[in-house]
Amino acid sequence: AESCTSRPHITVVEGEPFYLKHCSCSLAHEIETTTKSWYKSSGSQEHVELNPRSSSRIALHDCVLEFWPVELNDTGSYFFQMKNYTQKWKLNVIRRNKHSCFTERQVTSKIVEVKKFFQITCENSYYQTLVNSTSLYKNCKKLLLENNKNPTIKKNAEFEDQGYYSCVHFLHHNGKLFNITKTFNITIVEDRSNIVPVLLGPKLNHVAVELGKNVRLNCSALLNEEDVIYWMFGEENGSDPNIHEEKEMRIMTPEGKWHASKVLRIENIGESNLNVLYNCTVASTGGTDTKSFILVRKADMADIPGHVFTR
């Protein structure tokens, strides 16, 4: 059973079969004798009741208003009324793109990760019994698939799979041939699964400083969007008015991960800032990674091996 048309605003392409199904349908079957009315209003036109004589293209059923096919002048507001129940739809019929097998404004976009399962199934449950055949096109070129009733693609995605896939259903009604097109814009992206976040550079950094001067300690990491990067220092963070955490900067990598950096600024360096650990940590659901900075007076730098020294 096809679900009812609950969305209040609908856009459709001219020249295709289309239907509106009201949302009290089960109720309508229980009350066969109840008067059911469909109305249309557009522009200055007040609510005009629709009937089979309104247009040869319009068919009225208990639950459904059908268009064979829908045309540009069908744009407007449609109402269904039965007993205590009233429903309204605003229908916008747009021009078909005559230079393509699909109309850009009627495309559903989907993002698929490379190597992940990718599926396109051409189905149309409402018109199923009337469909003669269905074709699947990629970028308007017909794909040769075994099943011409419900063509399907099922595979692990590759970058070459990116493109516009159009399911075109061909059906007959009252001796006329119609088609219904449903198009998907498939974008293939890099694997977006989480990485283990990592801090860049050595785990322990000795920084040569001069008393009374300022220093900026830069902590950089490669991480996931939801991961956090923070500084820990002293017994109570924030107890030293000369220490400031700057705003975190983030740049997205081409792979969809994040490069983050957070600077700890120490102003007017004093003795109390020397030889203590300033720890930078990146934390995620998968665990943490920490690197440490130690400020060392320049005069004492001869005592430190060169390979652990940063400026």
Epitope: S6, R7, P8, C23, S24, Y39, S41, H47, S77, F79, Q81, N84, Y85, T86, Q87, K88, W89, K90
Partner: nanobody
Framework: EVQLVESGGGLVQPGGSLRLSCAAS????????MGWFRQAPGKEREGVAS???????YYADSVKGRFTISRDNSKNTLYLQMNSLRAEDTAVYYC????????????????WGQGTLVTVSS
Amino acid sequence: EVQLVESGGGLVQPGGSLRLSCAASGTAYDNACMGWFRQAPGKEREGVASIHLRDRTYYADSVKGRFTISRDNSKNTLYLQMNSLRAEDTAVYYCASSNICNALNLQGNTYWGQGTLVTVSS
């Protein structure tokens, strides 16, 4: 932008009358139905009256015969005429508009106003 703006609330004595207005933008006004709802302190919001396409009207049992819902299409405005007011009518009154309506139940994409306070007290 869809907007519903109520006005006309205030303090009134028991037995008195008030007329609430709801000015609506086009999309909200030309809907399947519009209605008045109310919420008394500590209670759930309840339907008071609704008017459907072709001016079909529905009322809560507690207001039948006392309240009248109407609209003026030239002004895109919904009204609620409240007569013989009682203390139990005290509430914030909301105007609403929906694309799916079943008597007083709004079941679809529903727009709400900010509400206007009606106090019935001596």
